[in-house]
């Protein structure tokens, strides 16, 4: 089975949402839906894995209902007709609270993890490879939907590549009902290794600059800063690193460093005091020459949320901010697997890190 690099996530999509699953569902694909159940309106939400956008053919309908003490309905819809419901009479979601919902596609079933615990197993009633779309509707606000392919060496890309000069990676903040597939960086036929998602969020509504509901505070803080984590397996062509957060209102600077031992292979340093995004490499405590050129205005704004996607390729790192390609940084340290540590510091609040 051919796999490509993991599909870029949908960030903060408006609900109701429909988005393409590039390459369709495949055995081993893991899809994470991260969001917050709205406390104000509605008693239901649903995540659907379906064929096309019509909603007539839904291979897996996952439907939590805050009714009759709370339960979750799982079902399949074929040619507009629903099959028999499977009900789980325990409710792992709480109104007004964020959740982490993970779907693992396997040959015989979907396995669903909610908040770190296996919640339900739903056996396929129709062939899962027909599914090419994920939709979400109901009483929920979404932070992101992310995709992770299994560790497999692809034979060929599972979807056609898009020239990198086009707007890339994440779709823009959705305003409409239906999401077309986002432009993506070319898929590299390289092994996909473990992705680690570290998620902590103190104010889900503040993850992006246009929250659907007022910010809500929760009794757990955001990432400790500076934040340091290991990049398992180091860098390699096709490796992606995703970060999102909010710039502090009084921010001067922050940095994202990709490190190799005592060296900083890539130093990404937005400077609000200079209105610049500085890139550099430090080897043996000596900085190289700075790169500052940008194709557009400074993408980071004090007090506003942001996403950064770093894609490693053979010769360079490609960096996108808020869904738009920003720059390329050609490797100065070329032993990519030794670049295995991420360090983030400065005047931001992190809300999501995926390595």
């Amino acid at each position: 089975m051919a796999f490509s690099g993991s599909q870029a996530p949908y960030l903060s999509p408006a609900v109701p949402f429909s988005g393409t699953i590039q390459g369709g569902l495949q055995d081993g694909l893991q899809i994470t839906v991260n969001g917050t159940v709205l406390s104000s309106s509605g008693t239901r939400f649903a995540v659907n894995f379906q064929t096309g956008f019509s909603g007539n053919d839904i291979a897996f309908h996952f439907n939590p209902r805050f009714e009759d003490g709370g339960y979750v309905v799982c079902n399949t819809r074929q040619n507009g007709s629903w099959g028999p419901e499977e009900r789980k009479t325990h409710m792992p979601f709480q109104k007004g609270m964020p959740f982490d919902l993970c779907f693992l596609v396997q040959s015989s079933d979907f396995k669903v993890m909610v908040n770190g615990i296996l919640f339900v197993q739903y056996f396929h009633r129709v062939p899962f490879h027909r599914v090419d779309t994920i939709s979400v509707n109901g009483s929920v606000q979404l932070s992101y939907i992310s995709f992770q392919n299994p560790r497999t060496v692809p034979v060929q890309p599972a979807f056609s590549t898009v020239p990198f000069s086009q707007p890339v990676c994440f779709p823009p903040r959705p305003r409409g009902r239906r999401q077309k597939p986002p432009g993506v960086w070319p898929a590299n036929p390289a092994p996909i290794t473990q992705t680690v998602i570290h998620t902590v969020q103190s104010a889900p509504g503040q993850m992006f600059s246009t929250p659907a509901i007022p910010p809500m505070m929760y009794p757990h803080p955001a990432y400790p800063m500076p934040f340091i984590t290991t990049i398992l397996g180091g860098l390699y062509p096709s490796k992606s690193i995703l970060l999102s957060g909010t710039v502090l209102p009084s921010a001067q600077r922050f940095h994202i460093n990709l490190c190799s031992g005592n060296h900083i292979a890539f130093h990404l340093n937005p400077r609000f005091d200079e209105n610049a995004v500085v890139r550099n490499t430090q080897i043996d405590n000596s900085w190289g020459s700075e790169e500052r050129s940008l194709p557009r205005k400074m993408p980071f704004v004090r007090g506003q949320s942001f996403s950064v996607w770093i894609l490693c390729e053979a010769h360079c790192l490609k960096v996108a901010v808020d869904g738009q390609h920003l720059f390329e940084y050609y490797h100065r340290l070329r032993n990519l697997p030794t670049i295995n540590r991420l360090e983030v510091g400065g005047d931001i609040q992190l809300t999501h890190v995926q390595t």
Partner: antibody, heavy 124, light 109 residues
Framework: EVQLVESGGGLVQPGGSLRLSCAAS????????IHWVRQAPGKGLEWVAY????????SYADSVKGRFTISADTSKNTAYLQMNSLRAEDTAVYYC?????????????????WGQGTLVTVSS | DIQMTQSPSSLSASVGDRVTITCRAS??????VAWYQQKPGKAPKLLIY???SLYSGVPSRFSGSRSGTDFTLTISSLQPEDFATYYC???????????FGQGTKVEIK
């Protein structure tokens, strides 16, 4: 190296309170669920509670519901178990454990790291 | 609640013996079953996760299997350091998302 270290156990009278801490190192508690499991003297393992720090989601065994509160401070990389209205039957060694759900491209349905345990004795 | 009924509660065996411990879940728990080894005064150690996957660093004489709601831990050739208490545990979301079996004490014959 991943490590969990519990503290806060001790002798307390029935009706009293204790707060147990579970300090984590080598990983961020925000990327896993953290569970408390207890073991009464000479008995088996009993699950007590868990927290999924990202979402703040918590769940409790019926035997402690309404009396115990689990929480986490991700800035300190520490989980806590606040135990109120303690009873003699709460006497046990309390362990915290990491329930790791995804590792090396495989789901890990198991508690892969445990602390050394802290003894709570409820007696008058 | 999902109950995990573990048997036997204790057994006596000799070094080199093949030992089998079973756990039966009261309802489907998918593959969300783990096995632990615990020695007196020590914390449990993970042996098997996801019903049949050997945890890293655990000797290959330990294995796990699943048949429906029946789960088995097998020690193919018992070693002196294997004398301990073994627990199964399920983590399939229910009113109690985690439950343990009662434990099996493996003693020297």
């Amino acid at each position: 190296e991943v490590q969990l270290v519990e503290s806060g156990g001790g002798l307390v009278q029935p009706g009293g309170s204790l707060r147990l801490s579970c300090a984590a190192s080598g990983f961020t508690v925000s990327s896993s669920s953290i569970h408390w499991v207890r073991q009464a003297p000479g008995k088996g393992l009993e699950w007590v509670a868990y927290i999924y720090p990202y979402s703040g989601y918590t769940s409790y065994a019926d035997s402690v519901k309404g009396r115990f509160t689990i929480s986490a401070d991700t800035s300190k990389n520490t989980a806590y178990l606040q135990m109120n209205s303690l009873r003699a039957e709460d006497t046990a060694v309390y362990y915290c454990a990491r329930y790791s759900t995804y590792s090396s491209s495989k789901w890990v349905w198991g508690m892969d790291y445990w602390g050394q345990g802290t003894l709570v004795t409820v007696s008058s | 609640d999902i109950q995990m009924t573990q048997s036997p509660s204790s057994l006596s065996a000799s070094v080199g013996d093949r030992v089998t411990i079973t756990c039966r879940a009261s309802q489907s728990v998918s593959s969300a079953v783990a096995w632990y080894q615990q020695k007196p005064g020590k914390a449990p150690k993970l042996l098997i996760y996801s019903a049949s996957s050997l945890y890293s660093g655990v000797p290959s004489r330990f294995s796990g299997s699943r048949s429906g709601t029946d789960f088995t831990l097998t020690i193919s050739s018992l070693q002196p350091e294997d004398f301990a208490t073994y627990y199964c545990q399920q983590s399939y979301y229910d009113s109690n998302p985690i439950t343990f079996g009662q434990g099996t004490k493996v003693e020297i014959k």
